[in-house]
Interface confidence: low
């Protein structure tokens, strides 16, 4: 049979993409359940994910209130079936997370090339302005709304028949690139926040090639 011994959570890790933010930890509980608390450096603790057997807690609703704040979370371990019990020091065991600043650390999600339109020797490529879970006036802000000109996109493009890539950059969501008339090109985009020290770049968008239905051609 089980015992009432609880162990502290460990390997507390923030997983965050486009501000969707989850705290993960170990171990999968045997003799215990977990409750998570989160706060800003100067704020009060707020409890989330009460008495769960899961080893993750979605904290998005809390961090999107102010993505430029620095947050700290802690995971409490309670004996299963007796959540009023405390540890030997008179309080439940807990472990602190690393600090997390969403604006500086959330991963940039994989971008999507929304459309491309060729007019003669120019191609206009538009990257989808992804919606985040950050709200303002009851509407969800886009990635561009949140990061403004801190966010740039890099476009990598090449002739379908060769492998030599060219690049273009924009601090909007649109590129205008020069191409050879009658030649098919492929491209992918990457989101970048140059001012960051970590998580500066997103993964590459799926590759799109001219001649596929997403594109449009006009002479």
């Amino acid at each position: 049979s089980g015992t009432t011994n609880t162990v502290a959570a460990y390997n507390l890790t923030w997983k965050s993409t486009n501000f969707k933010t989850i705290l993960e930890w170990e171990p999968k509980p045997v003799n215990q359940v977990y409750t998570v608390q989160i706060s800003t450096k100067s704020g009060d603790w707020k409890s989330k994910c009460f008495y769960t057997t899961d080893t993750e807690c979605d904290l998005t609703d809390e961090i999107v209130k102010d993505v430029k704040q620095t947050y700290l979370a802690r995971v409490f371990s309670y004996p299963a079936g007796n959540v009023e019990s405390t540890g030997s020091a008179g309080e439940p065991l807990y472990e602190n997370s690393p600090e997390f600043t969403p604006y500086l650390e959330t991963n940039l999600g994989q971008p999507t090339i929304q459309s491309f339109e060729q007019v003669g020797t120019k191609v206009n490529v538009t990257v989808e302005d992804e919606r985040t879970l950050v709200r303002r006036n009851n509407t969800f802000l886009s990635l561009r709304d949140v990061f403004g000109k801190d966010l740039i996109y890099t476009l990598y493009y090449w002739k379908s028949s060769s492998s030599g890539k060219k690049t273009a950059k924009t601090n909007t969501n649109e590129f205008l690139i020069d191409v050879e008339k009658g030649v098919s090109y492929c491209f992918f985009a990457q989101a970048v926040i140059p001012s960051r020290t970590v998580n500066r770049k997103s993964t590459d968008s799926p590759v799109e090639c001219m001649g596929q239905e997403k594109g449009e051609f006009r002479e």
Partner: antibody, heavy 125, light 108 residues
């Protein structure tokens, strides 16, 4: 009682993505269990692929992690496996299973108490 | 990764005999995470024992489990014809969850 049923194509071409779905009947996928995928290569032992909690929390086998995605659709009472860039080495019987946290006398015990019948997936061109 | 080593690979016994199957872990495993399964040809595994020693619902009492730490044992006190199958131990505590290589119990 709870039953699991795997479904999906039995033949997948190399380099493509294997997609399987496990439908849970006789109970709710949101009832606090973990839901796993396991495979068994022909004539071999069992290999755990990964699991998902009804909330969406996932754990994957590190040897497959770069190619595996497990997702849950609580509205359909289903969870799914996607395995990308498959090769002949991914030919196997694929099982879905329920990984139950059973509470007894102050502790949780974990075990896979309900399994699907398994579906054979062959990777071949 | 916790490696579970089962021995023997094959056990040749007659009905009515006692079968003792071993599962050794490369590092300590909480008994809460240790389970035993039976698999017959063409079928999915069936849970026999969980928590190292607790019988699953509907499992006859001739099946028993014991052990802790790194050494676990499944015992079938008196083999019935339907018991001839492959038996696997499994740990579901540390990712990746792992199975032993299996012990085949065959009719002598």
């Amino acid at each position: 009682q709870v039953q699991l049923q795997e479904s999906g194509p039995g033949l997948v071409k190399p380099s493509q993505t294997l997609s399987l779905t496990c439908t849970v009947s006789g109970g709710s996928i949101s009832s606090g269990q973990y839901w796993s995928w396991i495979r068994q290569h022909p004539g071999k032992g069992l290999e755990w692929i990964g699991e998902i909690y009804y909330s969406g929390s996932t754990r994957y086998n590190p040897s497959l992690k770069s190619r595996v995605t497990i997702s849950v659709d609580t509205s359909k009472n289903q969870f799914s496996l996607k395995l990308s860039s498959v090769t002949a080495a991914d030919t196997a019987v694929y099982y879905c299973a329920r990984d139950t946290p059973y509470y007894y006398d102050g502790g949780y015990y974990y075990y896979m108490d309900v399994w699907g019948k398994g579906t054979t997936v062959t990777v071949s061109s | 990764e916790i490696v579970l080593t089962q021995s023997p690979g094959t056990l040749s016994l007659s009905p009515g005999e006692r079968a003792t199957l071993s599962c050794r872990a490369s590092q300590s495993v909480s008994s809460s995470y240790l389970a035993w399964y039976q698999q017959k040809p063409g079928q999915a595994p069936r849970l026999l024992i969980y928590g190292a020693s607790s019988r699953a619902t509907g499992i006859p009492d001739r099946f028993s489990g014991s052990g802790s730490g790194t050494d676990f044992t499944l015992t079938i006190s008196r083999l019935e014809p339907e018991d001839f199958a492959v038996y696997y131990c499994q740990q579901v505590g540390v990712v990746p969850y792992t199975f032993g290589g299996g012990t085949k119990v065959e009719i002598k």
